[in-house]
């Protein structure tokens, strides 16, 4: 028997520095977690103790903090090289700055293979990107070889900016011939490493003949066997065993997100490449693991540029940006409108001639807007200003919801109106009218939404049985502020870009902003 240790991360999202337990900015260092310096300590410890170790990343290193905003992926290549990753799969967020924003900082600089079997380049891009990412890679590990085959969510064109010269194929259809190729090359230990979410990971384990292990990402799935060490609730045991259609027992793993855990899976193979046992658990990277001093010093060196950036002007406002709780928790506020407009703008993807865009709607809990921005400071808006407005380090995500769920959400928005509670919704691409004289749960008297399948966008009544795409904070997608109906009834959830980054990019693009209160949210006469 031959034993392989797979160390894995996924959805790190720019968390190069240690973070608090909820993966936001580290405040009390003695209780902070993760970060590449701490990760390196643990990886090195395992490499020293065990003979056959692979360190893999399942995508979405890009996007999530000011590190990515400033360094645009150069930081990913640099620190992943320093940690000596063995392979990485492309995630959807790796395309956030377009294909160029992937090629130059990461693909050309990485000293490890970057993989995806289901992304096919065409046109002029084909020769430009040739060899910079691969469908698979055969890695020597000790006296053996291990094949790693990559995959990426086929929804990437709706979630990021891969352009028109990359085709995202069905994962299973694309993976099978590559795995077959590895088999003909006498590679009998094959890991599928990719970024399509836990459901697809399980399908790959079930359907792709010859895959021995699946290491996934995208859905931030936390798996654990036994008592979990922190706040995350396991979605299943680690590893999660899937029985393939032909009867193989395939371990599937994922390691939550944000570099909080290091996935640790031990696989025992026989001489024929049969998996005869698998066990492990994610390792919580808490403060009991010291940060590696040399990596930490490097982080501090790279950090300097971030501090300078946060005080630089992004753009100007010529109006007061009203982000006060007195406004945003009671009525339409122009800060809410600005943020929602930025959220929609960030999700412009013209992928179908029938649609002007794939999504037109935004909702945002008023309680998530934490500060106004005064225009009487020469109109200057900085990252620092935006960090005061959006201090929680969340993301603006894409969900699919039925109209009936949206109606419930808007009823919840005003179910206890007047108490300055955070659930009051700010909107974009939505016109809502409330009648507060009616009983809670029956206060939405009009709800019109902006069409997407149209050449001239216009507002139509919400249809209860129709499925709509909506951009919203991850806080709401996870049921925050009492929006349990969103969490329980959402049909799809893809995590998006860092909230501050979305707004800062929009302001930089617009240069001068002047958001108004324009009648998106109304109260019917006599009730307000």
């Amino acid at each position: 028997a031959w034993e392989l240790t797979i160390l894995h991360t996924n959805d790190v999202h720019s968390r190069l520095e240690q973070t608090s337990e909820d993966s936001s900015k580290c405040v009390n260092a003695s209780r902070c977690m993760g970060g590449v310096a701490r990760l390196f300590t643990k990886v090195q410890q395992i490499r020293r103790a065990e003979p056959n170790v692979l360190l893999l990343d399942a995508g979405d290193q890009y996007q999530g903090t000011i590190w990515f905003t400033v360094y645009k992926g150069a930081e990913v290549a640099h620190f992943m090289n320093a940690l000596r990753y063995d392979a990485m799969a492309l995630g959807n967020h790796e395309f956030d700055n377009g294909v160029e924003g992937l090629i130059e900082p990461l693909l050309k600089e990485a000293k490890f293979p970057i993989l995806s079997a289901n992304i096919k380049a065409k046109g002029p891009l084909a020769s430009q990107i040739s060899g910079l990412y691969l469908p698979y890679k055969v890695l020597p590990v000790g006296d053996e070889v291990v094949g790693i085959v990559g995959y990426t969510s086929k929804e990437t064109p709706f979630l990021s900016n891969p352009g028109t010269n990359l085709v995202f194929e069905d994962e299973i259809t694309a993976l099978q011939p590559e795995v077959d190729k590895l088999k003909t090359l006498n590679v009998n230990k094959i890991i599928a490493l990719g970024h399509s979410g836990f459901e697809m990971d399980k399908l790959i384990a079930q359907k792709v003949r010859g895959v021995d292990v699946v290491v996934g990402g995208h859905s931030n799935t936390f798996l654990y066997t036994g008592n979990p060490p922190s706040k995350e609730v396991p979605a299943g045991k680690y590893p999660f065993i899937v029985t393939s259609d032909d009867g193989r027992k395939v371990p599937v793993v994922q390691a939550y997100a944000f570099g909080k855990y290091l996935g640790y899976l031990k696989i025992e193979f026989d001489e024929r490449g049969n998996v005869i046992s698998s066990h492990g658990n994610p390792i919580l990277l808490n403060s009991s693991i010291p940060e590696d001093p040399s990596i930490k010093a490097d982080i501090n060196k790279w950090r300097i540029k971030l501090d300078n950036y946060s005080t630089q002007e992004l753009g100007k406002t010529i109006v007061y940006l009203d982000g006060s709780s007195q406004s945003c928790r009671f009525r339409e506020c122009n800060m809410g409108n600005l943020i929602c407009d930025a959220m929609i703008n960030n999700n412009l993807r013209h992928t179908d001639e029938m649609f002007w865009n794939h999504v037109s709607m935004c909702i945002l809990n008023g309680g998530g807007i934490r500060s106004p921005i005064d225009e009487r400071n020469n109109g200057t808006i900085t990252w620092e200003n935006l960090a005061a407005v959006l201090p929680f380090g969340g993301t603006f995500d894409l969900v699919q919801l039925k109209g009936s769920t949206l109606k419930k959400a808007f009823e919840h928005s005003v179910h206890r109106y007047g108490q300055s509670t955070g659930e009051f919704l700010q909107v974009g691409g939505i016109h809502v009218v409330y009648d507060l004289s009616r009983k809670p749960g029956d206060r939405v008297v009009k709800l019109d939404v902006l069409c997407t399948k149209c050449r001239v966008p216009s507002y139509d009544p919400l249809k209860m049985d129709e499925v709509y795409k909506v951009i919203l904070p991850n806080f709401l997608a996870n049921g925050g502020d009492g929006f349990q109906m969103i969490k329980d009834e959402l049909l799809r959830h893809d995590s998006g870009d860092q909230d501050i980054n979305v707004v800062s990019t929009y302001i930089s693009k617009m240069k001068v902003i002047y958001p108004a209160v324009e009648g998106r949210i109304k109260f019917s006469t006599g009730s307000h």
Epitope: T243, D246, G247, K249, N274
Partner: antibody, heavy 119, light 107 residues
Framework: QVQLVQSGAEVKKPGASVKVSCKAS????????IQWVRQAPGQGLEWMGA????????RYTQKFQGRVTMTADTSISTAYMELSRLRSDDTAVYYC????????????WGQGTTVTVSS | DIQMTQSPSSLSASVGDRVTITCRAS??????LNWYQQKPGKAPKLLIH???RLHSGVPSRFSGSGSGTDYTLTISSLQPEDFATYYC?????????FGQGTKVEIK
């Protein structure tokens, strides 16, 4: 070395049941499927089904569904195949074999257990 | 279920002869084809897996080839100990199925 040792020959009456055992040694019993294959006198090989001792998952062919039960006792590394409602055409040599799941070949076989069904 | 058809059902050959046995599947089995040798009163023995890969300890005079639905077992120079019955088996789709066997007899 890796081996599978089966229980001895059985003579049964029609309508009765038979339970054949297969003891594994020399490898991780819970890591491989145990396949059951039978061979009627002068005939070819016929796959009946399989069990994965690691979680007692089973696969049976349509022909034997409802009549065959495969079990395993991991504490003694032994797999069992029970065939009920025996008929005379169930007279055969019953083999257990270890299945390799990369190609679904059977690389280690038991010596076979002869089951005779006769009134 | 996938049907496996072997030909010939039996053949007579002499020591030193080159012997070829074919196996046809009722559908594409993607090279998941295994060959076994069985001697009277004994359990089958694995010779070749995945069309052409020799199982450990099997002499190199045995070889396999084929793709799609048609596969071949070749014994380059028949030895006295090779007189036996040979079975093919597909490992592509459950239920696993065997060919009816080819008996190799002494001429």
């Amino acid at each position: 070395q890796v081996q599978l040792v089966q229980s001895g020959a059985e003579v049964k009456k029609p309508g009765a049941s038979v339970k054949v055992s297969c003891k594994a040694s020399g490898y991780t019993f819970t890591g491989y499927w145990i396949q059951w294959v039978r061979q009627a006198p002068g005939q070819g090989l016929e796959w009946m089904g399989a069990i994965y001792p690691g979680d007692e998952d089973t696969r049976y062919t349509q022909k034997f569904q409802g009549r065959v039960t495969m079990t395993a006792d991991t504490s003694i590394s032994t797999a069992y195949m029970e065939l009920s409602r025996l008929r005379s055409d169930d007279t055969a040599v019953y083999y257990c074999a270890r299945g390799n799941w990369d190609d679904w070949d059977f690389d280690v076989w038991g010596q076979g257990t002869t089951v005779t069904v006769s009134s | 279920d996938i049907q496996m058809t072997q030909s010939p059902s039996s053949l007579s050959a002499s020591v030193g002869d080159r012997v070829t046995i074919t196996c046809r599947a009722s559908q594409d089995i993607s090279n998941y084809l295994n060959w076994y040798q069985q001697k009277p009163g004994k359990a089958p023995k694995l010779l070749i897996h995945y069309t052409s890969r020799l199982h450990s300890g099997v002499p190199s005079r045995f070889s396999g080839s084929g793709s799609g639905t048609d596969y071949t077992l070749t014994i380059s120079s028949l030895q006295p100990e090779d007189f036996a019955t040979y079975y093919c088996q597909q490992g592509d789709t459950l239920p696993w199925t065997f060919g009816q066997g080819t008996k190799v007899e002494i001429k």
